[in-house]
């Protein structure tokens, strides 16, 4: 591919998503002469970096270079050598690094420093690593899915090709679930966004959008599980925690020091008379659901309505794309079909959680036990978050579309991030000539 007689007039961009549980590298490609057109950028590669999220390297920063090598070398292979020097590389770190920064700004800076040292040694145009805000994460996820769905285009292009096309220009809301945070972003219907922190104004392709967004730090699936364990161990009579969110017969020893390592469990921290405790699964969806609901404070709301923890949430409006862990978990549970009602999802979760651990291990022999053991919790958490947290109902459930990819590109914040940083989302409808940089978002 590197020796074409007539090179295509294309450009490439690389974004690394440094999430709390892992890092993924995405390579995007677009025709150089169509930079300002909507929907021309597409993903050509995803490379999942082997290992944990970058925040876990805080005591072993010397290993970061090796950690990133395979995927960066993959990028070197995929992108023609002649394009290397003009290919921008961006790294955005999300809630895992936000949490590390809350604990120690210096430790977070040390990790980012070494990440930048590592990435700048490649032949690309490295544009820096940074911790993106929760608001940015929500906004860029919203931009990504609507860009890929053709919602910013004046023509209803891709009608009948895009599976979620509703034959109108009404944007989709974005629901993103990570390991350490979750984001909800959508355009409310003629509703004032009562809290300024949750309001975004965009002008994209000649149209104004008033967007609501919020990122709930500590409410990603992994941190939510730590929160639940910290809450439940408070009332355990001994070092055994009988947990309804794990399959019957499942056992796991947890170090109390690991439990209290994250800022997300600080509110539940107490001196315990043991250093370790054992989770013993009892596999009961209803009890698991009840336990999860205790993580959402719904007793206080200073606005006309709230999601939870006193955070403003306007009435839900339109269709939503639910991606990242919303999709991965529901896909594993075989619950992503548009035809599966919320009641059916709940029924299937009840059955799944009640299945004995030995049976589950046999049925899913190829899946790592660490991940396999947590699907009951994660599935229940997704239902709790969407129904009680965000106030979806059995009726509005059908407006949630669990999306992995759209037109071959992963749904997530990375594409929107790159489109913005490369000035590829014009404020006005592009004419024949590109607009000056000052007019971009």
């Amino acid at each position: 591919t590197q020796n074409k007689a007539l090179p295509e007039n294309v450009k490439y961009g690389i974004v690394l998503d440094a999430g709390s549980s892992h890092t993924s590298l995405y390579i995007y490609k677009w025709p150089a002469e169509k930079e300002n057109d909507t929907g021309v950028v597409h993903q050509v590669e995803e490379c999942r970096v082997k290992g944990p999220g970058i925040s876990k390297f805080v005591q072993k920063v010397n290993e970061i270079g090796i950690y990133l090598t395979d995927c960066m070398e993959r990028a070197r292979e995929v992108i023609p050598r002649s394009q290397h020097q003009e290919t921008p590389v961006y790294l955005g770190a999300t809630a895992g690094m936000r949490l590390l920064r809350m604990e120690s700004e210096e430790l977070a800076d040390r990790v980012l420093d070494v990440v930048e040292r590592s990435l700048s040694n490649y032949p690309f145009d490295f544009q820096g690593a940074r911790i993106i805000t929760g608001q940015e994460e929500g906004a860029y996820g919203w931009i990504t899915i609507n860009y890929l769905l053709g919602k910013f285009s004046q023509k209803t292009r891709w009608f009948s090709i895009v599976p979620y096309e509703t034959n109108n220009q009404e944007t989709f809301g974005a629901l993103d679930l990570g390991g350490a945070s979750t984001q909800v972003t959508f355009v409310p219907q003629n509703q004032t966004i009562e809290s300024p922190d949750n309001a975004l104004q965009f002008r994209l392709y000649g149209k104004d959008y008033n967007v609501y967004t919020h990122s709930f730090l500590c409410y990603g699936k992994d941190q939510a599980l730590w929160q639940k364990l910290a809450k439940d161990i408070q009332v355990a009579s001994n070092e055994i925690l009988r947990d309804p969110c794990f399959h019957p017969g499942y056992k796991k020893v947890v170090n109390v020091s690991d439990l209290y390592k994250t800022p997300c469990t600080k509110r539940f921290e107490m001196t315990l008379p043991f250093q370790q405790f054992e989770i013993q699964g009892i596999g009961n969806y209803q009890q698991c659901h009840q336990s999860i609901l205790e993580l959402f404070n719904t007793s206080y709301c200073p606005y006309s309505q709230c999601a939870f923890n006193g955070i403003f949430l306007p009435p839900l409006q339109g269709d939503f794309g639910a991606f990242s862990a919303f999709y991965f978990v529901m896909k594993f549970l075989n619950l992503t079909s548009e035809k599966v009602s919320q009641e059916k999802v709940t029924e299937m979760m009840k059955k799944f959680c009640a299945q004995p651990w030995e049976e589950i291990k046999t049925s899913y022999a190829g899946v790592k036990e660490k991940y396999l053991s947590e699907y009951c919790f994660s599935g229940t958490y997704i239902l709790s978050l969407l129904l009680q947290g965000y106030h979806f109902t059995a009726d509005s459930w059908e407006h949630i579309h669990f999306i992995g990819k759209i037109q071959g590109s992963d749904a997530g914040w990375t594409l929107g991030y790159m489109l913005n940083l490369t000035n590829m989302i014009p404020a006005e409808q592009p004419l024949s000539t590109p607009l000056s940089h000052s007019t971009y978002v």
Epitope: V61, D109, V114, E116, F126
Partner: antibody
Framework: QVQLVQSGAEVKKPGSSVKVSCKAS????????ISWVRQAPGQGLEWMGS????????NYAQKFQGRVTITADESTSTAYMELSSLRSEDTAVYYC??????????????WGRGTLVTVSS | EIVMTQSPATLSVSPGERATLSCRAS??????LAWYQQKPGQAPRLLIY???TRATGIPARFSGSGSGTEFTLTISSLQSEDFAVYYC?????????FGGGTKVEIK
């Protein structure tokens, strides 16, 4: 109080190599990075590269890539800069400088006195 | 790489007067900019970092401002010891880069 003490002046022949040292006296590198900056006679400052001892791998300006090697010995709190294939244009004062901190704190809060390297046949 | 451009190359100022030095970056460096002073035969000395924060021991007559691509170093009332060459340096992205310098000389 930490000082950066550099090795003495050198006169080198074109085509040869030079290795300049920079020792943190009165302290250690204490997890700080060391950059090398050069200044040709009557010219401005030119960043050559940097090493963070706890990371080990150096970063270089593209202009010097392949010709410069920056290393650090944590046990002696000494950084080294080796420049090969010397030419007359490499005649300059070579400074080591400590980076103030990590990430966005890569400015230089402590400088060595400089080492004059003269390349002449 | 980010190109740093300083202007003017030379600034002639009388003692007691105000000196304003400019530094422009070829792309945004946010507020990640440092200023150094260098006197003949000496190593540079850090004056300002983060665009506007004075380094330890730097007199209050030195002030920095700006963000993004345009930066200014102001010396409010020049003292005899301030006549020197001043360099800006971006500390946002690799490779780290310096401006070409501004020589402040006695008028």
């Amino acid at each position: 109080q930490v000082q950066l003490v550099q090795s003495g002046a050198e006169v080198k022949k074109p085509g040869s190599s030079v290795k300049v040292s920079c020792k943190a006296s009165g302290g250690t590198f204490s997890d700080k990075a060391i950059s090398w900056v050069r200044q040709a006679p009557g010219q401005g400052l030119e960043w050559m590269g940097s090493i963070l001892p706890i990371f080990g791998t150096a970063n270089y300006a593209q202009k010097f890539q392949g010709r410069v090697t920056i290393t650090a010995d944590e046990s002696t709190s000494t950084a080294y800069m080796e420049l090969s294939s010397l030419r007359s244009e490499d005649t300059a004062v070579y400074y080591c400088a400590r980076e103030a901190g990590y990430y966005r704190y890569r400015y230089f809060d402590l400088w060595g006195r400089g080492t004059l390297v003269t390349v002449s046949s | 790489e980010i190109v740093m451009t300083q202007s003017p190359a030379t600034l002639s100022v009388s003692p007691g007067e105000r000196a304003t030095l400019s530094c422009r970056a070829s792309q945004s460096v946010s507020s990640n900019l440092a200023w150094y002073q260098q006197k003949p035969g000496q190593a540079p000395r850090l004056l300002i970092y983060g665009a506007s924060t004075r380094a330890t021991g730097i007199p209050a007559r030195f002030s920095g401002s700006g963000s993004g691509t345009e930066f200014t170093l102001t010396i409010s009332s020049l003292q005899s010891e301030d006549f020197a060459v001043y360099y800006c340096q971006q500390h946002a992205l690799w490779p780290l880069t310096f401006g070409g310098g501004t020589k402040v000389e006695i008028k």
